[in-house]
């Protein structure tokens, strides 16, 4: 089938990085600047993606592959292929309409992106709190009191005092 197709369609012989030029008797012409073809047999080359502004070039466009963008420092990508950039916050914060805000008491965020999530409720699994949670870290659950050897007691430090009021970054 491949041989039949190439006899009938000269374009199938054009490799990646070229296109089958109808204006020049269907000969294989190189992709023009700022365009690419990632597969053979293409009748046109695709325009390269441009990484500008909040985007920066992670991988340059070549005649056979598209450019890839990521976000400038202080931002992270959203969407497949980095279609949007969102501001980073510090660990222990989340991005709101008013900017980066500290996680409320009882919640944490261990990343520079995303939302603050509630601490794990150890008691739901019949366990006790081994290490208290912070704005940046979840609680660490320890063994349930019943699992402890006789005479031993669970180390359950007192809950931390409420953190000071939030102020915008």
């Amino acid at each position: 089938f491949e041989r039949t197709r190439s006899l009938q369609d000269p374009c199938s012989n054009c490799p990646a990085g070229t296109f089958c030029d109808n204006n020049r008797n269907q000969i294989c012409s190189p992709c023009p600047p700022n365009s690419f073809s990632s597969a053979g047999g293409q009748r046109t080359c695709d325009i390269c993606r441009q990484c500008k502004g909040v985007f920066r070039t992670r991988k340059e466009c070549s005649s056979t592959s598209n450019a890839e963008c990521d976000c400038t420092p202080g931002f992270h990508c959203l969407g497949a292929g980095c279609s949007m950039c969102e501001q980073d916050c510090k660990q222990g914060q989340e991005l709101t309409k008013k900017g980066c805000k500290d996680c409320c008491f009882g919640t944490f965020n261990d990343q520079k992106r995303g939302i603050c999530r509630p601490w794990t409720n150890c008691s739901l699994d019949g366990k006790s709190v081994l290490v208290n949670g912070t704005k940046e870290r979840d609680v660490v659950c320890g063994p349930s009191p019943a699992d402890l050897s006789p005479g031993a007691s669970s180390v359950t430090p007192p809950a931390p005092a409420r953190e000071p009021g939030h102020s915008p970054q």
């Epitope: 502004g53 202080g74 279609s83 949007m84």
Partner: antibody, heavy 115, light 107 residues
Framework: QVQLQESGPGLVKPSETLSLTCTVS????????VHWIRQPPGKGLEWIGA???????DYNAAFISRVTISVDTSKNQFSLKLSSVTAADTAVYYC?????????WGQGTLVTVSS | DIVMTQSPDSLAVSLGERATINCKAS??????VSWYQQKPGQPPKLLIY???NRYTGVPDRFSGSGSGTDFTLTISSLQAEDVAVYYC?????????FGQGTRLEIK
């Protein structure tokens, strides 16, 4: 809170220069750039150009000979200048923060070109 | 320049019914298409970015799909507050370009 507000004269005479400012708050001008986009009455959106956080600019080729976009960080303002205007430049002009997909826009300001 | 062509130009749909708006790009733009909603006297509001990602706070009745040259915005169950003009726009290559808009009304 992220806010952008366009301002400038609502009426400009033909052949004169249209000058608008975009005053921003809630984000740093050294971190984000701004795009200018316009919308003639009852029509669609047209990208004019952008200034990036480093101060460099990109313009739509349709405007390149008569457009200048600049920034004044001390005033938290971006500006748009469009020279030699005609009635075809009558539009609502918007500034929008550069985040890759225009999540934050100003309310827009209507500029009418008429003698 | 990449030309974005929307269809239809206007659309009337009954409350609670599905509304579908199409957008065709003159070149392959991957998934770098956004959808905006604009109500009279207001700036456009971002609904969808990256062809299919709902922006923060956008109701889940709005969804986007497509890649390459063909894109669709779907409103699964039309509400009265969805009456507006909808625009697609490509953020793939400069100059950035938008569709001509689709006016959505209630039947």
């Amino acid at each position: 809170q992220v806010q952008l507000q366009e301002s400038g004269p609502g009426l400009v005479k033909p052949s004169e220069t249209l000058s608008l400012t975009c005053t921003v708050s809630g984000f740093s001008l050294t971190t984000y750039g701004v795009h200018w986009i316009r919308q003639p009455p009852g029509k669609g959106l047209e990208w004019i150009g952008a200034i990036w956080s480093g101060g460099s600019t990109d313009y739509n080729a349709a405007f390149i000979s008569r457009v200048t976009i600049s920034v004044d960080t001390s005033k938290n303002q971006f500006s748009l200048k469009l020279s030699s205007v005609t009635a075809a430049d009558t539009a609502v002009y918007y500034c929008a923060r550069d985040d890759g997909s225009f999540a934050n826009w100003g309310q827009g300001t209507l500029v009418t070109v008429s003698s | 320049d990449i030309v974005m062509t929307q269809s239809p130009d206007s659309l009337a749909v009954s409350l609670g019914e599905r509304a579908t708006i199409n957008c065709k790009a003159s070149e392959n733009v991957g998934t770098y298409v956004s959808w905006y909603q604009q109500k009279p006297g207001q700036p456009p509001k971002l609904l969808i970015y990256g062809a299919s990602n709902r922006y923060t706070g956008v109701p889940d009745r709005f969804s986007g799909s497509g890649s390459g040259t063909d894109f669709t915005l779907t409103i699964s169950s039309l509400q009265a507050e969805d009456v507006a003009v909808y625009y697609c726009g490509q953020t793939y290559s400069y100059p950035l370009t938008f569709g001509q808009g689709t006016r959505l009304e209630i039947k």
